[in-house]
């Protein structure tokens, strides 16, 4: 077995993509490695080439089919192998049985848009991308708003504990530029994690109306 300095971590996007990262201290940067996926109850198997993302880390995406096709279910187990070329043959570096729906990381939400904006509030909607119909409504969201003079890390998180693809931001400052992001997570899965944050949506609140003489 490879020693504890190596890590092999994969996530399923719930449709047709398994993304993997393999890291190993002391591995040669130009070593040719790949991930091989072999489901226990499917006729297909898939391979992707691991490409360097840092000094000792490689990543690749197993494309299982068309982006919105449902290639795996909750009962599937996929055997994942890391193989690295040694001379003329491939050496198995790691073997992992992977339950896709225990290791979910969805795609970032898309199509963010301002539905309605006022001086102190803004209604924003979005869509989820390539998410399995198996979830039905069992999803949650986190959102954050970037206000002037602050960083994303300082932005408070707003939690939506249901499948709600819109939000009404309130107590905003008039005539001010903001940015908004959202991410999504299924409720099921031992190692399920948040999607990446969406692309930021920039918006500006309306100026306050000028006071009228009485």
């Amino acid at each position: 077995a490879v020693n504890g300095t190596s890590q092999f971590t994969c996530f399923y996007n719930s449709r047709a993509n398994i993304s993997c990262v393999w890291s190993q201290d002391g591995a040669l940067q130009d070593t040719s490695c790949q991930v091989h996926a072999w489901p226990d109850r499917r006729r297909w198997n898939q391979t992707c080439e691991l490409l360097p993302v840092s000094q000792a880390s490689w990543a690749c995406n197993l494309i299982l089919g068309a982006p919105d096709s449902q290639k795996l279910t909750t009962v599937d187990i996929v055997t994942l192998r890391v193989l690295c070329r040694e001379g003329v043959r491939w050496r198995v570096m790691a073997i992992q049985d992977f339950k896709p729906f225990e290791n979910l990381r969805l795609m970032a939400p898309i199509s963010l848009q301002v539905v309605h904006v006022e001086t102190h509030r803004c209604n924003i909607s979005w869509e989820i991308s390539q998410a399995s119909h198996y979830f039905e409504r069992h999803l949650e969201f986190e959102a954050r708003t970037l206000s002037p003079g602050h960083t994303w890390e300082e932005a408070p998180l707003l939690t939506l504990k249901q499948k709600q693809e819109w939000i009404c931001l309130e107590t905003l400052t008039p005539d001010t530029q903001y940015e908004f992001q959202v991410r999504v997570k299924p409720l099921q899965g031992e190692f399920t994690t948040w999607s990446p944050w969406s692309q930021p949506l920039a918006f500006r609140t309306k100026p306050a109306a000028l006071g009228k003489d009485t």
């Epitope: 077995a1 490879v2 020693n3 504890g4 190596s6 890590q7 092999f8 971590t9 790691a94 992992q96 049985d97 992977f98 339950k99 225990e102 290791n103 899965g189 031992e190 190692f191």
Partner: nanobody
Framework: QVQLVESGGGLVQAGGPLRLSCAAS????????MGWFRQAPGKEREFVAA????????MYAVSTEGRFTCSRDNAKNTVYLLMNSLKPEDTAVYYC????????????????????WGQGTQVTVSS
């Protein structure tokens, strides 16, 4: 903490299958990562497989060549090791072990990572 008892070992012909079981009692089974190790005569204890608390990820020793399958049933407080296409070199005492610390299932754990051990069950593969 849990106590572990292995069963299912015995004599089997090369090429045949065998399923080992490890029953846990006296604790919350689902709060432990579980592993299988083996020790052949005159050799050091060797990692075989380890599975996470919920069974979402399971790592296997490269030497198993995909012939072994480790699974767990948290409702039955049991972890299994299904061994197919057995070879004489698989002959060893097989140990079940439990890990109290968190295990992500993304790396190969060391035997020292496991706190609780069963007494072992002998597997002999004849040619």
């Amino acid at each position: 903490q849990v106590q572990l008892v292995e069963s299912g070992g015995g004599l089997v012909q090369a090429g045949g299958p065998l399923r080992l079981s490890c029953a846990a009692s006296g604790g919350t089974f689902s709060s432990y990562a579980m592993g299988w190790f083996r020790q052949a005569p005159g050799k050091e204890r060797e990692f075989v497989a380890a599975t996470t608390r919920g069974g979402g990820r399971t790592m296997y020793a490269v030497s198993t060549e995909g012939r072994f399958t480790c699974s767990r049933d948290n409702a039955k407080n049991t972890v299994y090791l299904l061994m197919n296409s057995l070879k004489p070199e698989d002959t060893a005492v097989y140990y079940c072990a439990a890990m109290t610390s968190y295990y992500s299932g993304t790396y190969y754990p060391d035997s020292s990572d496991f706190d609780i051990w069963g007494q072992g069950t002998q597997v002999t593969v004849s040619s």
